[in-house]
Each structure stands twice: as structure tokens, then as C-alpha cells.
Interface confidence: medium
């Protein structure tokens, strides 16, 4: 046990206030009562402590709460949160969305730090699922949050939470993630009418199967090329030229510009050249006339 320096006469802190910024580190250690600090944490954020002084304050809280801080303290950590390590945060039990918001606010405008990632992980695990309010909050601070989750983690997202998702939240999602999210979105938006449904489901279509794309092609949705290019290749390949034409509507013109890129390139290779020619776009690479097309997947299923 290190011998502690005594607090100089008249310097014992009676409250957490601006006068403490003039204290040396050893004076803060000796003169600030940890329990007082814990009850007046909200004041710390309004005082321009140096990083070294904040280290002392953190040390005092660590001594007071070796098993992890209570939520009443966590909610008011403010800038002191930036001093916490992921190991510190793993000891916490954060259940209030207000606490989560308060700490995310401190880190606002910065990349998601390991501390924030650990905090979010603890919070979501504590709740058992990623509910709508939590998802709303997290995507407001970190638009890429949803796409940072594994498909396994995404499986805990209830369909009702999908209403909180904005198109930009899915920008960096890969096909495996969209495979998980799409069925949830389909369920969430099932009671909407045609055009409204398409607006909502559009961002999730990278996880849609062929039969759903075929169904959409019957609804005059006029899918834009950017959305089409994000569709699963295996879902696009079975679509006929007529179905793609209906699906894209006036945007079908854009196929020419994308004919060398997936999934358009692979889709062209599966179509009869005669059928492609009906589009009048000059798409080349289809199956020449007179050739027989064998659906090998069907053949394997029969044998």
C-alpha cells in the first residue's frame, strides 16, 4: 500500500467546482473525496480539467467502485468516458437508453472507438435484442452501425426495429447481412401498399430472392439501376428479359452502361440473344439463336 500524502490545511474539497483546476495532481488525489466526486459527476464536464487531472479523478472512481461504476455515475461521466478502457466498460451494467445517449454524445463526430463499441455491445446484450429505440439511437450517431454487425448479431433484430432503418444505414452492408435483414423488412412492411412498400423495401433488396423480384416486376416499380446492381447475382440470373424490362421500367436504358459489370454481365450471358435484341440497347453476349439452354440445376434435382 502506497503511503498517501495528506491534504494541505484548508484545501479539502467541499464540492466539485472550478477551484479544483488549480489543484496539482497530488492535491486532487489527497483532497477530493471519491464519494463526493461520484455524487457530483455532472459538474466535472463543465470544468476544464487537464487530461492529467481527469486521470486522477478516474483513479478515484476506480478505487471507489472496483467492480464497475453504478449507472448513476456512468450517466454523468461526460468527458471522463474518453478515459475509460474497454476493460473498464466491460464491468458496467448499462440499461438506460438515456445513459447510452449521454455517452455517445461525448464521442459525437468521431469514429466509433473501441470504448464505444464495447459500450454498445454491453448495452445490446443487456437488453437481449436490438429494439427500435436503441437502433434509432445508434444509427443516428453511427449510420454504419447496422452493417458493422455480424449476420448472427443481426438475427436478434426484431422486424419492428426495421422501421428505424434509413437507406444510408445499409450503404456498407454486404450480401450476407442483407440476406438476414431482407426477410425482417418484408415482414415489417407487409401491410403497406405497392408503391409505398417498394420505397421502404428498396434498400433491403440486396437480400431478395428471385421470386420476390419476379413479383416486384409485376408492380410497375421502376427500380433504378443503382438498386438493380446491388441485387444478388443468383437472384437476378433466372429473371427473363421481359421481367427485367418490367422491373426497371424506363431505367432499362441503363443496362447498356453496366453490361460489363455484375450482375448485368452474368445475366446477359444467360439470356437468348434474340430476347436481348428486343430491348434495342445493343446488348451483346447472349446465347446465340438455335442453341439449347440446359438448366443444370434442374437436371441435378431430377437425378
Amino acid at each position: 500500500e502506497v503511503e498517501k500524502t495528506a491534504c494541505p490545511s484548508g484545501k479539502k474539497a467541499r464540492e466539485i467546482d472550478e477551484s479544483l483546476i488549480f489543484y496539482k495532481k497530488w492535491e486532487l488525489e489527497a483532497c477530493v473525496d471519491a464519494a463526493l466526486l461520484a455524487t457530483q459527476m455532472d459538474r466535472v464536464n463543465a470544468i476544464p480539467f487537464t487530461y492529467e487531472q481527469l486521470d486522477v479523478l478516474k483513479h478515484k472512481l476506480d478505487e471507489l467502485y472496483p467492480q464497475g461504476y453504478p449507472e448513476s455515475v456512468i450517466q454523468h461521466l461526460g468527458y471522463l468516458f474518453l478515459k475509460m478502457s474497454p476493460e473498464d466498460i466491460r464491468k458496467w451494467n448499462v440499461t438506460s437508453l438515456e445513459t447510452l445517449k449521454a455517452l455517445l454524445e461525448v464521442n459525437k463526430g468521431h469514429e466509433m472507438s473501441p470504448q464505444v463499441a464495447t459500450l454498445i455491445d454491453r448495452f445490446v446484450k443487456g437488453r437481449g435484442q436490438l429494439d427500435k429505440d436503441t437502433l434509432d439511437t445508434l444509427t443516428a450517431f453511427y449510420p454504419g452501425y447496422l452493417c458493422s454487425l455480424s449476420p448472427e448479431e443481426l438475427s436478434s433484430v426484431p422486424p419492428s426495429s426495421i422501421w428505424a432503418v434509413r437507406p444510408q444505414d445499409l450503404d456498407t452492408c454486404d450480401p450476407r447481412q442483407l440476406d438476414v435483414l431482407y426477410p425482417k423488412a418484408r415482414l415489417a412492411f407487409q401491410n403497406m401498399n405497392g408503391s409505398e412498400y417498394f420505397v421502404k423495401i428498396q434498400s433491403f433488396l440486396g437480400g431478395a430472392p428471385t421470386e420476390d423480384l419476379k413479383a416486384l416486376s409485376q408492380q410497375n416499380v421502376s427500380m433504378d439501376l443503382a438498386t438493380f446492381m446491388k441485387l444478388r447475382t443468383d437472384a437476378v440470373l433466372p429473371l427473363t428479359v421481359a421481367e427485367v424490362q418490367k422491373l426497371l421500367g424506363p431505367h432499362v436504358e441503363g443496362l447498356k452502361a453496366e453490361e460489363r459489370h455484375r450482375p448485368v454481365r452474368d445475366w446477359i450471358l444467360r439470356q437468348r440473344q434474340d430476347d436481348l435484341d428486343t430491348l434495342g440497347l445493343g446488348l451483346q453476349g447472349g446465347i446465340p439463336n438455335g442453341y439449347l439452354v440446359l438448366d443444370l440445376s434442374m437436371q441435378e434435382a431430377l437425378s
Epitope: 472550478e18 464536464n45 463543465a46 470544468i47 476544464p48 461526460g78 459525437k108
Partner: nanobody, 115 residues
Framework: QVQLVESGGGLVQPGGSLRLSCAAS????????MRWYRQAPGKGLEYIAG???????YYADSVKGRFTISRDNSKNTLYLQMNSLRAEDTAVYYC?????????WGQGTQVTVSS
């Protein structure tokens, strides 16, 4: 968003006085502590004085007894009355506050103490 604009700086002789003002773009009634810092040529930022919303004041030892901080909530303005000025008080003086985890600073006002 809080905009802070300092004024009142200038050239003054040693022993003279100046009064700096810091006008805020929003009501300072709800803002907690407001502060004055200064930065002398080639030096770091130095905390000079602070005043909480309840009127409690704090001063660095270097200005204690010579400078007085005050605020007028009705005018959304913070003041720094500087008396018995010395050559070492020459610096750019900045007004500062923290609100919603954002640090807000004014553009600064130059104070030069010279004979």
C-alpha cells in the same frame, strides 16, 4: 451552437485599465461556467478567470486582486475588468464556454501593455 465575440482590447500603458466584453449569440442564462483565457506570444493557453451561472468566481493566482470577472445575463455578455495592467499581461484574450459537450471559443481580442 453558441457564437462568442470578444471586444475591448487595445494598447494600454503599464498600470492602466481595460474592460473586455464577450457577447454570446444565445442566452447565457442557461450556460454554466463562462471563462476567460489568454495566450501570450509563443506561450500556451492560460486560464485567467471563470464565473459559474450562480455567480461564483475563480481566478488564476497571476491575476487575483487585479482582474474581476462578471456577467450580465440580460445582455448575454461576460466581462473582464483588468486593472493594474503589466507588460506580462500582453496576450490575445479569449472567451470560452462548454455547452452540450462542445467547447466554444471566441476569435480573441488583443491586449498590449506597453509604454
Amino acid at each position: 451552437q453558441v457564437q462568442l465575440v470578444e471586444s475591448g482590447g487595445g494598447l494600454v500603458q503599464p498600470g492602466g485599465s481595460l474592460r473586455l466584453s464577450c457577447a454570446a449569440s444565445t442566452s447565457i442564462f442557461s450556460i454554466g461556467t463562462m471563462r476567460w483565457y489568454r495566450q501570450a506570444p509563443g506561450k500556451g493557453l492560460e486560464y485567467i478567470a471563470g464565473m459559474t451561472s450562480d455567480g461564483t468566481t475563480y481566478y488564476a493566482d497571476s491575476v487575483k486582486g487585479r482582474f474581476t470577472i462578471s456577467r450580465d445575463n440580460s445582455k448575454n455578455t461576460l466581462y473582464l475588468q483588468m486593472n493594474s495592467l503589466r507588460a506580462e499581461d500582453t496576450a490575445v484574450y479569449y472567451c470560452n464556454t462548454v455547452a452540450h459537450f462542445q467547447n466554444y471559443w471566441g476569435q480573441g481580442t488583443q491586449v498590449t501593455v506597453s509604454s
